[in-house]
Interface confidence: low
C-alpha cells in the first residue's frame, strides 16, 4: 500500500507535473522512528520506476544525495509523455530474506502546454436549437487541460461554458445552451476558446458570426406524395418545414439509379408538383431547407420517402418472331415468340398477352390470352396468315405488333450471302453477311436467329433473335452465348411477303474436343467400306466441330496412318472409304477437329476387307 505512506514521504522538485525534456528530483524520507529496527544505519532507500504497472528500472545509480539511514534524493531524466509511477522502498540489508518494504510513491506527469485552439465552428440546429461550437485543440497535452468557450454579443450578452480533456475524454465541443432568435439576424457575435493546464495557457483568435451564418434549419419532416388521378408520371410532393424557410432543394431518383434529379423551389410552403416521373417505378425523394436566399446553410437532407409511382398502360412495340413446321400435307404448326417489354415500356406488371392469328383472305381469326412469352397453334398450310401480340397491365394494353407469317427460308433469291461467324470474346459472336444477290423484292429487315446445337434444343428452348435494319450487314450476338458451345446461326432476309435464309455454325470460344467419335460399325458394300459412328457427346465437343478424320493403318505396321477428312454434318454418321487392300487386317479410328485443334483418338476397330479392292 504505497499510498498510505506510514513509513515516510516522497517529494518531487520542481513539481509532479513537468514539461517534456525536463528532469526532476525525487526525495524519499523516512518518518522519525521508522526504518530497520536495531540497525538504523543499515536503512537503504531504493527508488523503483513503473510504467503501466510494470517495473522498468531500479534507480539506485541515480542517487544525487544521501543522508544515510534517513533520506535519499534521486534524479530522474528522459521521462516519456504521460504518467510514470515512482515507488520508494526500504531495504534492510542485514535481513536478505525479507523483501524491500514500500515507503511511499509519487506519480510524475510529463506533458506540454496547450496550443491555441483553432478552426472554431459554431452551429445552431433549427430555430429553437442552442448554439454549439467545436474547435481543433492542437497537439495532445497528456495533461488535464481545461477549455473555456466564451460568447459575447449585442446588449451586453455574455455566456461561457467549460470542459476538460484528459487521457479518458477529449474536449473539443461545447453547447452553450442559449438560443439565438431570428430577430437578431443582423447582429454580430464573437466566440473565443481559452485552454489552460499546469504548464501554461493559450487563447484562440476571436471568431465572429451572425445568426444566418450559424443557424442550420432542421431537415423537413412528414414527407408524402399524392399522385394526381392515380397518374404514374405526375405527383405533388408535400412536407413540413420550420416557419422561416424560404428555399428548398428537392432531389429524387429511381432506386436503382446513380444520379439524382435536382430541383430548387422558392417559397414552396411545403408543396411542389413533379411532372416527369416514370410510371411503376420505385423512387426515393429527399428535401433540404434554407432560411435565406443568398446566405446561410442548407439543412441536412430529410429522411428518404420511398414509394412506387402508379402504373400506366404499356407503350412500345413487342419484338415478335416465329417458327413454322409442317406437320403433314395440309397442316402446319406456328410457334410465336416475343420478348418481354422493358420496365419503361411495360409501365406496370404485365398481366397477360393478347395473341391473334388471322388468315387474311378468309378472315379466319384465332385469339387467345397467355401469361407466357410464346404461343403455339396448328393451322392450315394454305392461305396468308398474319400474327399480332399486345401486352396488358392493370391500366390497359399496348398497341398490337403485327408480323406476316411467311416461309422463312422459302425463297432462295432472298438468301443472304457470305455469312460468317467470328468469335469476338468469351460471350460474343460477330455475324456478318452480304445482301441477297438477285432479290426480286426489297429486304425490309434481317433477323439473326441462334440456338445452341444440343439435343432437344429446338423443342426445349425458344430461339434467340435480333432484328437488324436492312442497311446493316452485321450483328454482335451475346444473349445466352456461352464459351465452348456451338450455335446454329441463321440470317433471315424478310421482304413483305417472302423470306430467305442462310445458316452457319459458330462459337464464342473453342478448345479441342475432349474425345473422338465412337466407331460403331464397319460394313463392306460393293467393294467399299462404310464407317459408322456416334457423334461426340455435346459437353465434350467444346465448340463447333469443323471436320471428322478417319484414320487407318495395317495392324502391326509402324508406318504413318492414312486419313480421310470429311466435312462435319450433324445429320451424317457414316462415310465410305475405298483404298483398303482385301484380306489385310486394318486398325481404324476417328478424331474430331475444332478451330482450336484435334481431339484425342476415339475407339480403335479392326477390320479385314474381303472383297476385291479398287
Amino acid at each position: 500500500n504505497i499510498d498510505v505512506c506510514k513509513l515516510g514521504t516522497v517529494t518531487v522538485q520542481p513539481a509532479p507535473v513537468i514539461p517534456l525534456g525536463s528532469a526532476a528530483n525525487i526525495s524519499c524520507s523516512l518518518n522519525p522512528k521508522q526504518g530497520c529496527s536495531h540497525y538504523p544505519s543499515s536503512n537503504e532507500l531504493i527508488l523503483l520506476k513503473f510504467v503501466n504497472d510494470v517495473l522498468v528500472e531500479n534507480l539506485h545509480g541515480k542517487k544525487v544525495h544521501d543522508h544515510t539511514g534517513h533520506s535519499s534524493t534521486f534524479q530522474v531524466t528522459n521521462l516519456s509523455l504521460g504518467m510514470t509511477l515512482f515507488v520508494c522502498k526500504l531495504n534492510c540489508s542485514n535481513s536478505q530474506k525479507k523483501p524491500p518494504v514500500p515507503v511511499c510513491g509519487v506519480e510524475i506527469s510529463v506533458g506540454v502546454a496547450p496550443e491555441p485552439p483553432q478552426n472554431i465552428s459554431c452551429v445552431q440546429e433549427g430555430e429553437n436549437g442552442t448554439v454549439a461550437c467545436s474547435w481543433n485543440s492542437g497537439k495532445v497535452t497528456y495533461l488535464k487541460t481545461n477549455y473555456t468557450l466564451q460568447l459575447s454579443g449585442p446588449n451586453n450578452l455574455t455566456c461561457q461554458k467549460q470542459c476538460f480533456s484528459d487521457n479518458r475524454q477529449n474536449c473539443n465541443r461545447l453547447d452553450l445552451g442559449i438560443n439565438l432568435s431570428p430577430d437578431l439576424a443582423e447582429s454580430r457575435f464573437i466566440v473565443r476558446v481559452t485552454a489552460i493546464n499546469d504548464l501554461g495557457n493559450s487563447s484562440s483568435l476571436p471568431h465572429t458570426f451572425t445568426f444566418l451564418d450559424i443557424v442550420i434549419p432542421l431537415p423537413p419532416w412528414d414527407i408524402r406524395i399524392n399522385f394526381l388521378n392515380a397518374s404514374g408520371s405526375r405527383g405533388t410532393l408535400q412536407w413540413e418545414d420550420e416557419g422561416q424557410v424560404v428555399l428548398n432543394q428537392l432531389r429524387y431518383q429511381p432506386l436503382n439509379s446513380t444520379s439524382w434529379n435536382m430541383v430548387n423551389a422558392t417559397n414552396a410552403k411545403g408543396k411542389y408538383d413533379l411532372r416527369d416521373l416514370r410510371p411503376f417505378t420505385e423512387y426515393e425523394f429527399q428535401i433540404s431547407s434554407k432560411l435565406h436566399l443568398s446566405g446561410g446553410s442548407w439543412s441536412n437532407w430529410s429522411e428518404s420517402l420511398r414509394t412506387r409511382t402508379p402504373e400506366e398502360e404499356p407503350v412500345g412495340i413487342l419484338d415478335i418472331w416465329y417458327m413454322k413446321q409442317d406437320i403433314d400435307y395440309d397442316r402446319q404448326q406456328i410457334s410465336l415468340f416475343w420478348k418481354s417489354l422493358n420496365p419503361s415500356e411495360a409501365r406496370g406488371k404485365i398481366l397477360h398477352y393478347q395473341v391473334t392469328l388471322q388468315e387474311v383472305t378468309k378472315k379466319t381469326t384465332l385469339q387467345n390470352t397467355t401469361r407466357h412469352t410464346s404461343w403455339t397453334r396448328v393451322i392450315p398450310r394454305t392461305g396468308a396468315w398474319t400474327a399480332s401480340v399486345s401486352a396488358a397491365n392493370s391500366k390497359g394494353a399496348s398497341a398490337p405488333t403485327h408480323i406476316n407469317i411467311v416461309d422463312l427460308c422459302g425463297t432462295g433469291l432472298l438468301a443472304p450471302h457470305q455469312v460468317s461467324a467470328k468469335s469476338e470474346n468469351m460471350d460474343n459472336i460477330l455475324v456478318t453477311w452480304q445482301p441477297p444477290k438477285k432479290a426480286d423484292s426489297a429486304v425490309r429487315e434481317y433477323i439473326v436467329e441462334w440456338r445452341a446445337l444440343q439435343p432437344g434444343s429446338i423443342t426445349k428452348f425458344p430461339p434467340h433473335w435480333l432484328r437488324i435494319p436492312p442497311d446493316n450487314m452485321s450483328a454482335l450476338i451475346s444473349e445466352n452465348i456461352k464459351p465452348y458451345i456451338c450455335y446454329e446461326i441463321r440470317v433471315h432476309a424478310l421482304s413483305e411477303s417472302q423470306g430467305g435464309c442462310s445458316s452457319i455454325r459458330g462459337d464464342s470460344k473453342h478448345k479441342a474436343p475432349v474425345s473422338g467419335p465412337h466407331i460403331t460399325a464397319i460394313t463392306e458394300k460393293k467393294e467399299r467400306l462404310f464407317i459408322s459412328w456416334t457423334h461426340i457427346p455435346f459437353p465434350e465437343q467444346r465448340g463447333c466441330i469443323l471436320h471428322y478424320r478417319i484414320y487407318w493403318k495395317e495392324r502391326d505396321s509402324t508406318a504413318q496412318p492414312e486419313l480421310c477428312e470429311i466435312q462435319y454434318r450433324r445429320s451424317q454418321n457414316s462415310h465410305p472409304i475405298s483404298s483398303l487392300q482385301p484380306r489385310v487386317t486394318y486398325v481404324l479410328w476417328m478424331t474430331a477437329v475444332t478451330a482450336a485443334g484435334e481431339s484425342p483418338q476415339g475407339n480403335e476397330r479392326e477390320f479385314c476387307p474381303q472383297g476385291k479392292a479398287n
Epitope: 504497472d53 510494470v54 517495473l55 528500472e57 523483501p99
Partner: nanobody, 122 residues
Amino acid sequence: QVQLQESGGGEVQAGGSLRLSCVASGRTFSVYTTGWFRQAPGKERELVAGMSGTRTYYADSVKGRFTISRDNAKNTVYLQMNSLKPDDTAVYYCAERRYGGPSLVWDEYDYRGQGTQVTVSS
C-alpha cells in the same frame, strides 16, 4: 521454501513450437506474479512474459507468438512458444514475486528456477 522447476526445453526447427512448464512446490500462498525470463549467451537476462492475476505482459519480440498461462490446481505456469526463430535460442527461467506486478528486474523476484535450454536451429 518454494522451489521452481522448469521443463519442456529442447531442440526444435525454426517455425516449430515448444511448451515450457514451471512447477512450484512448497508454496503456502496463492497471490503471486510469475515471469518467464531468458538469457542468451553473451546477452543480458530479459523478461519475455509475465502474469499477475489475470493480467499478462509480453516483450515486443515475442508478442503474438508466445502465450503465458496458469493452472492453479497443478501449481504450474506454462509458456507456449509458437513460430520459433533462431533468435529465441536461450536458457529460459521461471521466477515468482510475492509482491507487486511483473518486473523487468530479475533481482526483484523472490523465487527463481534453474532454467531449461531451448535451441532453435534454422
